[in-house]
């Protein structure tokens, strides 16, 4: 039975040209995390595999950095980066947990972080 929950950074905003950390945290389970995928609806950004390490998709190599931890740092943000991002935690023995982050990239210099929230 899947008892865990994913906590994410929730709805976040950042300035164009700046950088942002996408972060998820799996709690309330003793399941072992074996892989984490970072995805958009139509493309994979990066994978962190317990045995193989990090893999960054070639289309993001210049502006995506692994970490901190299992998170992902997006750099040189453009307005086209606005949208949903998913962290997909592959675990044993529970299965797959998913968290969702909505990023808004702003032209303005005012970019405040949204509140944290949980996805079961």
């Amino acid at each position: 039975m899947m008892t865990g929950t994913i906590e994410t950074t929730g709805n976040i905003s950042a300035e164009k040209g700046g950088s942002i950390i996408l972060q998820c945290h799996l709690s309330s389970t003793t399941a072992q995390v074996t892989q984490v995928n970072w995805e958009q609806q139509d493309q994979l950004l990066a994978i962190c595999n317990a045995d193989l390490g990090w893999h960054i998709s070639p289309s993001f190599k210049d502006r995506v950095a692994p970490g901190p931890g299992l998170g992902l740092t997006l750099q040189s943000l453009t307005v086209n980066d606005t949208g949903e991002y998913f962290c997909i935690y592959h675990t044993y023995p529970d299965g797959t947990y998913t968290g969702r982050i909505f990023l808004e990239v702003l032209e303005s210099s005012v970019a405040e972080h949204g509140a944290r929230f949980q996805i079961p």
């Epitope: 892989q35 994979l44 595999n49 193989l52 893999h55 998709s57 289309s59």
Partner: antibody
Framework: DVQLQESGPGLVKPSQSLSLTCTVT?????????WNWIRQFPGNKLEWMGY???????RYNPSLKSRISITRDTSKNQFFLQFNSVTTEDTATYYC???????????WGQGTLVTVSA | DIVMTQSHKFMSTSVGDRVSITCKAS??????VAWYQQKPGQSPKLLIY???YRYTGVPDRFTGSGSGTDFTFTISSVQAEDLAVYYC?????????FGGGTRLEIK
């Protein structure tokens, strides 16, 4: 549990347009996920055609982009494939499918066979 | 587009045997490969995603392995009901693409 059911004309003439409907039960197409069309040619080859996401965004296979459109009717919990200028090469079984965030396909309809013939 | 090649169109095996089906990607897809089973007259059914993770309810005789460009799907002890066509799919980048399929025949 979510169920998907395709419906369509069965037989279409070359150069005509094809319209297919996917009716989803057990889950609202506006709640989450991306809702896809995938076709399977007579030789068994599978081809991903495109999707419409729960928020209404669409993404198409570049090889088909100029000929297809995916839309939806949220009140009926249906999404549609509009396929223009079909040829005999478009004869296939057409499936609708719900994609997981990681872009694998856990849920499929039963498929509807479309034959393009004069 | 990423081309997924299943070199064997047909494989023949006996009940109880171990059988492995291979799939090769035209470029590095890390671990972003899924496997499907399609029985006669049915739609494809997801078995494996992310190269090695069994989907919910899939028997543990089905396993997947591999990374980069070379992937393997294995049935440890073939059952009569495993008669089907098996497809790999890359979920690395759009357009998502499938292998041509390997038909498993039971002797």
């Amino acid at each position: 549990d979510v169920q998907l059911q395709e419906s369509g004309p069965g037989l279409v003439k070359p150069s005509q347009s094809l319209s297919l409907t996917c009716t989803v039960t057990g889950y609202s197409i506006t709640s989450d996920y991306a809702w896809n069309w995938i076709r399977q040619f007579p030789g068994n080859k599978l081809e991903w055609m495109g999707y419409i996401s729960y928020s209404g965004n669409t993404r198409y296979n570049p090889s088909l982009k100029s000929r297809i459109s995916i839309t939806r009717d949220t009140s009926k919990n249906q999404f549609f494939l509009q396929f223009n200028s079909v040829t005999t090469e478009d004869t296939a079984t057409y499936y609708c499918s719900r994609k997981y965030y990681g872009s694998w396909f856990p849920y499929w309809g039963q498929g509807t066979l479309v034959t393009v013939s004069a | 587009d990423i081309v997924m090649t299943q070199s064997h169109k047909f494989m023949s095996t006996s009940v109880g045997d171990r059988v492995s089906i291979t799939c090769k990607a035209s470029q590095d897809v890390f671990t972003a490969v899924a496997w499907y089973q399609q029985k006669p007259g049915q739609s494809p059914k997801l078995l494996i995603y992310s190269a090695s993770y069994r989907y919910t309810g899939v028997p543990d005789r089905f396993t997947g392995s591999g990374s980069g460009t070379d992937f393997t799907f294995t049935i440890s002890s073939v059952q009569a009901e495993d008669l089907a066509v098996y497809y790999c799919q890359q979920h690395y980048s759009t357009p998502w693409t499938f292998g041509g399929g390997t038909r498993l025949e039971i002797k």
